[in-house]
């Protein structure tokens, strides 16, 4: 036997108080599938959230972060605040690398620069706050069409919870 | 793409009405529509909305006093009642989208409702 | 219901002047706001939407602000062909009475 509610479209929900028959998910609620008994109500984009694309009748609000703020988790459940480059966020704020690490964007943690002497290369420019070590080519490598410059470090996920 | 009202008449105070807009070009499943009128002189007055999914929102003053209807093309307004302050200026609109929260980008011309004994 | 107020109910400018019109929400409403331009025998055209992006062909003279409850609409380097009634009118959805669609009184512009 066929259940009825497999027939109400997106949009719409499986209404037992009126005999199962499908109604149309009311303003600020959706649903993204059919046959559902319940509409879900719409996400809030609010405070330092921004609405990106908005609630229908079919889909629920997308939000992401107002300008200094990036998104974290899955669907921007969470917005970070913003460091400037050669910085990352603590629990006190933005806080400068420490010597010795680096940060080339507006999030994530100060990673140590590269160890070129590890891999028996020169140090070709020095490393900055907001800037890896370049290292140069090996003494062997100085071949013709060699590639002169290691890439950076891999970047990590930040080890810390969001503010 | 196009909205066109139609049914605009004189009517006697008390005698329903009932007025169509019908639509082409797009589909009345994607996208909501308003009925909003506007008295001779004055501002316009939104009566009511069909959402893109079928759900129907009066202007809370409305009591009763129109009905909205949606079939695939035509969206209808019927003045259940006309008295001599429902003489207007009918416009239908479509969104510019099917969110709840949209506005309202294509209009008809209008159809004038004149109640009078 | 939301109660749009809109001021003043006319105002009168020089052709290249600038027109401020404002319009006031009686609950926050975001940025969910539209102005509309009216013509005597023509339908409303939407002029803006969000608050402040401009519609699709809209003269770059127009320019919306605000968000909340308080909203402008200002006409800058006025033409002739900017005599109309202006009307705002929220867009949101999903206030305590489901009720978000309503009008601005209008302000009726004058180009001299």
């Known amino acids: 036997l066929q259940d009825p509610c497999s027939n109400c479209p997106a949009g719409t929900f499986c209404d037992n108080n009126r005999n199962q028959i499908c109604s149309p998910c009311p303003p600020n609620s959706f649903s993204s599938a059919g046959g559902q008994r319940t509409c879900d109500i719409c996400r809030q984009c609010k405070g330092v959230f921004r609405t990106r694309k908005e609630c229908s009748s079919t889909s629920n609000a997308e939000c992401d972060c107002t300008p200094g703020f990036h998104c974290l988790g899955a669907g921007c459940s969470m917005c970070e605040q913003d460091c400037k480059q050669g910085q990352e966020l603590t629990k006190k704020g933005c806080k400068d690398c420490c010597f010795g690490t680096f940060n080339d964007q507006k999030r994530g943690i100060c990673r140590p620069w590269t160890n070129c002497s590890l891999a028996g290369k020169p140090v070709l420019m020095n490393g900055t706050k907001a800037r890896d070590v370049v290292c140069g080519p090996r003494p062997a490598d100085l071949s013709p069409g060699a590639s002169s410059v290691t890439p950076p470090a891999p970047a990590r996920e930040p080890g810390h919870s969001p503010q | 793409q196009s909205v066109e009202e139609s049914g605009g008449r004189l009517v006697t105070p008390g005698t329903p009405l009932t007025l169509t807009c019908t639509v082409s070009g797009f589909s009345l499943s994607t996208y909501a529509m308003i009925w909003v009128r506007q008295a001779p002189g004055k501002g316009l007055e939104w009566i009511g909305v069909?959402?893109?999914?079928?759900y129907i929102s009066h202007a809370t003053w409305v009591k009763g006093r129109f009905t909205i209807s949606k079939t695939s093309t035509t969206v209808g307004l019927e003045i259940t009642s006309p008295t001599t302050e429902d003489t207007a200026t009918y416009f239908c609109?479509?969104?510019?989208?099917?969110?709840?929260?949209?506005?309202?980008?294509?209009w008809g011309q209008g159809t004038l409702v004149t109640v009078s004994s | 219901d939301i109660v749009m107020t809109q001021t003043p109910a006319s105002v009168e400018a020089a052709v290249g002047g600038t027109v401020t019109i404002k319009c006031q929400a009686s609950e926050s409403i975001s940025n969910y706001l539209a102005w509309y331009q009216q013509k005597p025998g023509q339908p409303p055209k939407l002029l803006i939407y969000k608050a402040s992006t401009l519609a699709s062909g809209v003269s770059s003279r127009f320019k919306g602000s605000g968000s909340g409850t308080e909203f402008t609409l200002t006409i800058s380097d006025l033409e002739s062909a900017d005599a109309a009634t202006y009307y705002c009118?929220?867009?949101?959805?999903?206030?305590?009475?489901?009720?978000?669609?309503?009008f601005g009184g209008g302000t009726e512009v004058v180009v001299k």
């Open positions: 609109a479509r969104s510019a989208d099917g969110s709840w929260s949209t506005y309202f980008n294509l």
């Open positions: 009118q929220t867009n949101y959805c999903c206030s305590s009475s489901d009720n978000g669609f309503a």
């Open positions: 069909v959402y893109d999914n079928g």
